[in-house]
């Protein structure tokens, strides 16, 4: 009878109703391996979540958060607020990076500007909330009169401009 | 501040239909990610979820209740109402609503706030 | 439906005491899986979300852990005003379910 079982495929099941018959896996529910004495009840993705995608008789639904919202967890068991690029979240809410942070992502948080002067290098573009600074070559390896290139920025660390 | 509220007859008698409404405040029914379940409690005994509805109509019903049990809302109202026919001694419970669907930093979908119940008792 | 089972229905613990409880579901469903605690009289109090996500407020001495189909609510170091009865419920599709709950009495 075990090996009557194992020949039912992916989207069926085991049916011991019926003499172990491989049957159609109900509606609303899957079997994602061979063999299997039931079929499972797929995730249904309501309220603060969204279906990313849709059940079927081999695989799972996978869902997605609603807008304004992103993924955490395994397999998306929450949602965790968006914030705006040059914020990071807080237990109450987006928060604007501090001087000297930045975040180019709607998730994560503020990390701190690159040290140019630590790779013996100049600040070539200034940091802002969203990006970081852009570390250009040491002041020694312009050679004088060599290019007509916009003078690196003064090695104020670490760079910003004007928010 | 978030609060539910139940509210309905204390008694009932058997082949009556029960009424009950869930009054909620602090929170907007039309809110698309926000649910509202009904559940009870028998004397001693464990929770059981009966119905569920959400901000689009969208209904859940217990496969041993579906029957018996209808669920509407009035978002004018602030209210979710639950009707359950053909009432037996077996349904005395206390009758809880609960939301799901929080608001904040990080949101899910487990009941965060319950109402503080009431009791439904069916006699004759 | 999705069905629940606790283990132990009722469970004596002294105060300190570490205290886990099982709960199992018929079918896996990841980690979508949530606990509350439940006093006399009271309503349903929500704990872990996520399986193991902490609801805002609650002390640290509770965590949650598993996925799939076993899970447990672990109590550190058992406080007086823990003796409650405590419930799990399936996050993975409607209607919600819950397990038949787990009474933890003072010993």
């Known amino acids: 009878l075990q090996d009557l079982c194992s020949n039912c495929p992916a989207g069926t099941f085991c049916d011991n109703n019926r003499s172990q018959i491989c049957s159609p896996c109900p509606p609303n529910s899957f079997s994602s391996a061979g063999g299997q004495r039931t079929c499972d009840i797929c995730r249904q993705c309501k309220g603060v979540f969204k279906t990313r995608k849709e059940c079927s008789s081999t695989s799972n639904a996978e869902c997605d958060c609603i807008s304004g919202y992103h993924c955490l967890g395994a397999e998306c068991s929450m949602c965790e607020q968006d914030c705006k690029q040059g914020q990071e979240l807080t237990k109450k809410g987006c928060k604007d990076c501090c001087f000297g942070t930045f975040n180019d992502q709607k998730r994560g948080i503020c990390r701190p500007w690159t040290n140019c002067s630590l790779d013996g290098k100049s600040v070539l573009v200034n940091g802002t909330k969203e990006r970081d600074v852009v570390c250009g070559p040491s002041p020694a390896d312009l050679s004088p009169g060599a290019s007509s290139a916009t003078p690196p920025a003064p090695a104020r660390e670490p760079g910003h401009s004007p928010q | 501040q978030v609060t539910l509220k139940e509210s309905g007859p204390v008694l009932v008698k058997p082949t009556e239909t029960l009424t009950l409404t869930c009054t909620v405040s602090?929170?907007?029914?039309?809110?698309?990610?926000?649910?509202v379940s009904w559940i009870r409690q028998p004397p001693g005994k464990a929770l059981e979820s009966l119905v569920h509805?959400?901000?689009?109509?969208?209904?859940f019903f217990s496969t041993s209740l579906k029957s018996r049990l209808t669920i509407s809302k009035d978002t004018s109202k602030s209210q979710v109402v639950l009707t359950m026919t053909n009432m037996v001694p077996v349904d005395t419970a206390t009758y809880y609503c609960?939301?799901?669907?929080?608001?904040?930093?990080?949101?899910?979908?487990?009941?965060?706030?319950w109402g503080q119940g009431t009791m439904v008792t069916v006699s004759s | 439906d999705i069905q629940l089972t606790q283990s132990p229905s009722f469970l004596s613990a002294s105060v300190g005491d570490r205290v886990t409880i099982t709960c199992r579901a018929s079918?896996?469903?990841?980690?979508?899986l949530a606990w509350y605690q439940q006093k006399p009289g009271k309503a349903p109090k929500l704990l872990i979300f996520a399986a193991s996500t902490l609801q805002n407020g609650v002390p640290s001495r509770f965590s949650g852990s598993g996925s799939g189909t076993e899970f447990t609510l672990t109590i550190s170091s058992l406080q007086p005003e823990d003796f409650a009865t405590y419930y799990c419920q399936q996050l993975n599709n409607y209607p919600r379910t819950f397990g038949q709950g787990t009474k933890v009495e003072i010993k």
């Open positions: 509805i959400f901000s689009n109509d969208e209904k």
């Open positions: 609960a939301r799901n669907g929080g608001f904040g930093v990080i949101i899910h979908d487990a009941f965060d706030i």
């Open positions: 079918q896996g469903i990841s980690s979508y």
């Open positions: 602090g929170f907007s029914l039309s809110n698309a990610r926000v649910g």
